[in-house]
C-alpha cells in the first residue's frame, strides 16, 4: 500500500531583533515531537523592517505600530492560521536601546511600552519585549552558530553536512559586529577567565562549557565612526575635517549636535566654534587605520592580557564565526573567501579606500550612498578591531570564517535566544529512543 503523509506536526516561533540601525523579524520552525533534538530548528523567513532602529522613535513613539506592520503581516501570512495563537513572539533590543537607557530609563521604557502595545494587536502569543544584555547577545550568538554547526550533537559523522565543519566537537568562537556594539565569545583553552563578568558556564546536551564573552558598547561600526569623528574634530583647525576613512572627493556636512547626541562621543565632547563641519575624504587606508587605533586604549591592563580599554581577553582558541556586520561588510568588499589572507585583505582595502568617490558611485550605482560611503571606514575598522583589538594575527586570520547563514539560518543571537526561552536546549543529553518518530505510516 502507498505511504500516506500525516499532517505536518510543526511549531513556529518569532524573534524580533531590534538593533541600533534597523529591526529584523525572524520566523523559526521545528518538528513538534523533536523539540529537544539538536539542529532541528531552522529559519523559514527573515523580514527586514523598513526604517531605522526603534531607539530612533523616542520622539515619535506613535509611529512604532505602523513601522512594525509589514513584517508582522508577513508573519501572519507565513505561519498557518491554526498555529497563530500558539506561536511565541519575543522582541530583544540590543545596544541602540542600551544607549538610550543610559540617557533615560523612562524614554527607553516608553519605547518598549509602545512596542508591546503594537505587538499585542496580532494573533500570536506575545511573550515580552526587553533590552538584552551585551553578555546575553554574545552568549546567544555563540549558541546559535554552534547549534547550527552541529557542535552540540553527540553523533560523530564521517561526512560533513555543514559548511566549516571540522568533524570534531570543538565549538566555534563567535564574533558579532552590530551598529552600536561588538561581541567576542569563545571557549578558551584551559585558561582561567580572570574577570567574573566575562565568564559564563553552560551545561548543554550533557556537556559543560566554560565560555568567555565580552560586549564592547560603543564599538559597533556606526558608533565607532561617531567616536572617530568626535575625536578627530577636536584637533581640526577649522570646520573642514580631512578624513582618510572616506574616498577622495567625498564630501558630507555633519551637525555637531548629531555628533554629540550619542553617549559614545561624550569623552571627546568639547565646545567647538562652529555648529557644522564638512568631512572631505582623502581615502588613505593607513592613516584611517591609525586614526581608528586611537579609539582603543591599550596602555592599561589589570589582567594577564587584555583586548583594549582594560578588558580581559584570554588567548584566542580555535575557529571563529564572524557574522552580522563582519559578514555584510566583508561580503560587499568581496573578502569573505577562506582563501583570502589577511595581507591580501589589507591590500584590497588600501586599493578600495583610495578609489575616487565618483568612480565608486559609478561602480556601485545600485547601493545607497549613505551605506556606500562608509564601506572604507567599516572595512578598515573590522581589520583594526580583529587585529589590534582582539589580537588576531596574519596566521590566525585563517581561523576566522565570515558567515552569513548556516544551513539557511542567519548567524546571530536570535535563534539562540529563542532556543533558550522556549527551553529547547536541554542541560542533559536526551535519551535516544529506539525508533525515530516517522511522518509516514
Amino acid at each position: 500500500t502507498q505511504n500516506k503523509a500525516l499532517p505536518e506536526n510543526v511549531k513556529y516561533g518569532i524573534v524580533l531583533d531590534a538593533g541600533s540601525s534597523h529591526t529584523s523579524l525572524y520566523i523559526y520552525k521545528w518538528p513538534a515531537e523533536k523539540e529537544n533534538d539538536t539542529g532541528v530548528v531552522h529559519q523559514v523567513e527573515e523580514c527586514r523592517v523598513k526604517g531605522p532602529g526603534i531607539s530612533k522613535f523616542v520622539q515619535k513613539v506613535n509611529e512604532i505600530g505602523i513601522y512594525l506592520t509589514d513584517c508582522m503581516e508577513r508573519a501572519r501570512e507565513v505561519i498557518p492560521r491554526s498555529q497563530h495563537q500558539e506561536t511565541p513572539v519575543y522582541l530583544g533590543a540590543t545596544a541602540g536601546m542600551r544607549l538610550l537607557r543610559m540617557e533615560s530609563e523612562e524614554l527607553a521604557d516608553r519605547v518598549l511600552d509602545v512596542v508591546e502595545r503594537s505587538l499585542s494587536n496580532y494573533p500570536f502569543d506575545f511573550q515580552g519585549a526587553r533590552i538584552i544584555t551585551g553578555q546575553e547577545e554574545g552568549a546567544y550568538g555563540w549558541i546559535t552558530i554552534n547549534y547550527l554547526l552541529g557542535k552540540f550533537s553527540q553523533k560523530t559523522r564521517w561526512f560533513s553536512i555543514v559548511p566549516y565543519e571540522t568533524n570534531n566537537q570543538e565549538t566555534f568562537g563567535a564574533l558579532d559586529l552590530g551598529g552600536a556594539s561588538t561581541q567576542v565569545t569563545f571557549v578558551p583553552q584551559n585558561q582561567t577567565i580572570e574577570s567574573p563578568d566575562n565568564a559564563l558556564q553552560f551545561r548543554l546536551y550533557g556537556k559543560d562549557y566554560n565560555v568567555y564573552t565580552h560586549s564592547f558598547l560603543c564599538y559597533g561600526k556606526d558608533q565607532a565612526l561617531w567616536q572617530k569623528l568626535a575625536k578627530d574634530i577636536q584637533v581640526a583647525s577649522n570646520e573642514i575635517l580631512r578624513d582618510p576613512c572616506f574616498h577622495p572627493g567625498y564630501k558630507k556636512v555633519v551637525n555637531v549636535s548629531d555628533l554629540y547626541k550619542t553617549p559614545c562621543t561624550k569623552r571627546f565632547e568639547m565646545t567647538l566654534p562652529f555648529q557644522q563641519f564638512e568631512i572631505q575624504g582623502i581615502g588613505n587606508y593607513q592613516q584611517c587605520h591609525q586614526s581608528i587605533l586611537e579609539l582603543f586604549n591599550t596602555s592599561y591592563c589589570p589582567y594577564s592580557q587584555c583586548a583594549f580599554n582594560g578588558i580581559f581577553l584570554p588567548p584566542l582558541q580555535g575557529d571563529f564565526g564572524a557574522f552580522s556586520a563582519f559578514y555584510f561588510v566583508m561580503k560587499f568588499l568581496n573578502l569573505t573567501s577562506e582563501k583570502v589572507s589577511q595581507e591580501k585583505v589589507t591590500e584590497m582595502m588600501k586599493k578600495f579606500c583610495a578609489q575616487p568617490w565618483e568612480e565608486i558611485k559609478t561602480s556601485y550605482a545600485g547601493v545607497k550612498e549613505k551605506y556606500l560611503s562608509e564601506y572604507c571606514f567599516s572595512g578598515t575598522y573590522i581589520l583594526s578591531l580583529l587585529l589590534q583589538g582582539y589580537h588576531f594575527t596574519a596566521d590566525s586570520w585563517e581561523h576566522i570564517h565570515f558567515i552569513g547563514k548556516i544551513q539557511g539560518s542567519d548567524a546571530g543571537w536570535t535563534l539562540g535566544y529563542m532556543l533558550n526561552l522556549t527551553n529547547m536546549i536541554p542541560a542533559e543529553q536526551p535519551l535516544s529512543t529506539p525508533l525515530s518518530h516517522s511522518t509516514y505510516v
Partner: nanobody, 126 residues
Framework: QVQLQESGGGLVQAGGSLRLACTVS????????MGWFRQAPGQERDFVTA????????HYADSVKGRFTISRDNAANTVYLQMNTLKPEDTAVYYC???????????????????WGQGTQVTVSS
C-alpha cells in the same frame, strides 16, 4: 531571582471590595508578566488573572471577569488586584506570581517558570 511580597488581604463582607498589592524586588520588573492565583482549602491552586510586562495584555478566569481588575505600576515595581463584588466563593489564599518573558496566556496555563509569593489570605463572609 525576583522576590515577591503580597499585601492587602483580610476579612471583607460579601459584596465588598479589597485591593491586593504585590511588590517585586530584584530583576527588571517590566520583563515579567505578573499574575494572581488562588487556593481555597483542599483545592488546587487556580489561575485568577495575569498581565503582560507593560500592561497591554490581560487575561482573567471566567469566574472573576467583570469583578476583578489587574493593573501594574512599573515605576513602583508593583502589581495590583482590585476585587469588587466579592463572593464567599472568592475566599482563598491569593498568591502573586511572576514569569519572565512569558505571556499572560502561558501563565494562565501555568506554563513556563513561575516565581511565587508567600500568599495573603482573603476571607469573604456572607
Amino acid at each position: 531571582q525576583v522576590q515577591l511580597q503580597e499585601s492587602g488581604g483580610g476579612l471583607v463582607q460579601a459584596g465588598g471590595s479589597l485591593r491586593l498589592a504585590c511588590t517585586v524586588s530584584r530583576g527588571t520588573f517590566s520583563e515579567y508578566s505578573m499574575g494572581w492565583f488562588r487556593q481555597a482549602p483542599g483545592q488546587e491552586r487556580d489561575f485568577v488573572t495575569a498581565i503582560s510586562g507593560f500592561g497591554h495584555i490581560t487575561h482573567y478566569a471566567d469566574s472573576v471577569k467583570g469583578r476583578f481588575t489587574i493593573s501594574r505600576d512599573n515605576a513602583a515595581n508593583t502589581v495590583y488586584l482590585q476585587m469588587n463584588t466579592l463572593k464567599p466563593e472568592d475566599t482563598a489564599v491569593y498568591y502573586c506570581a511572576a514569569a519572565w518573558q512569558t505571556s499572560p496566556r502561558r501563565m494562565m496555563q501555568m506554563a513556563g517558570s513561575i516565581t511565587w509569593g508567600q500568599g495573603t489570605q482573603v476571607t469573604v463572609s456572607s
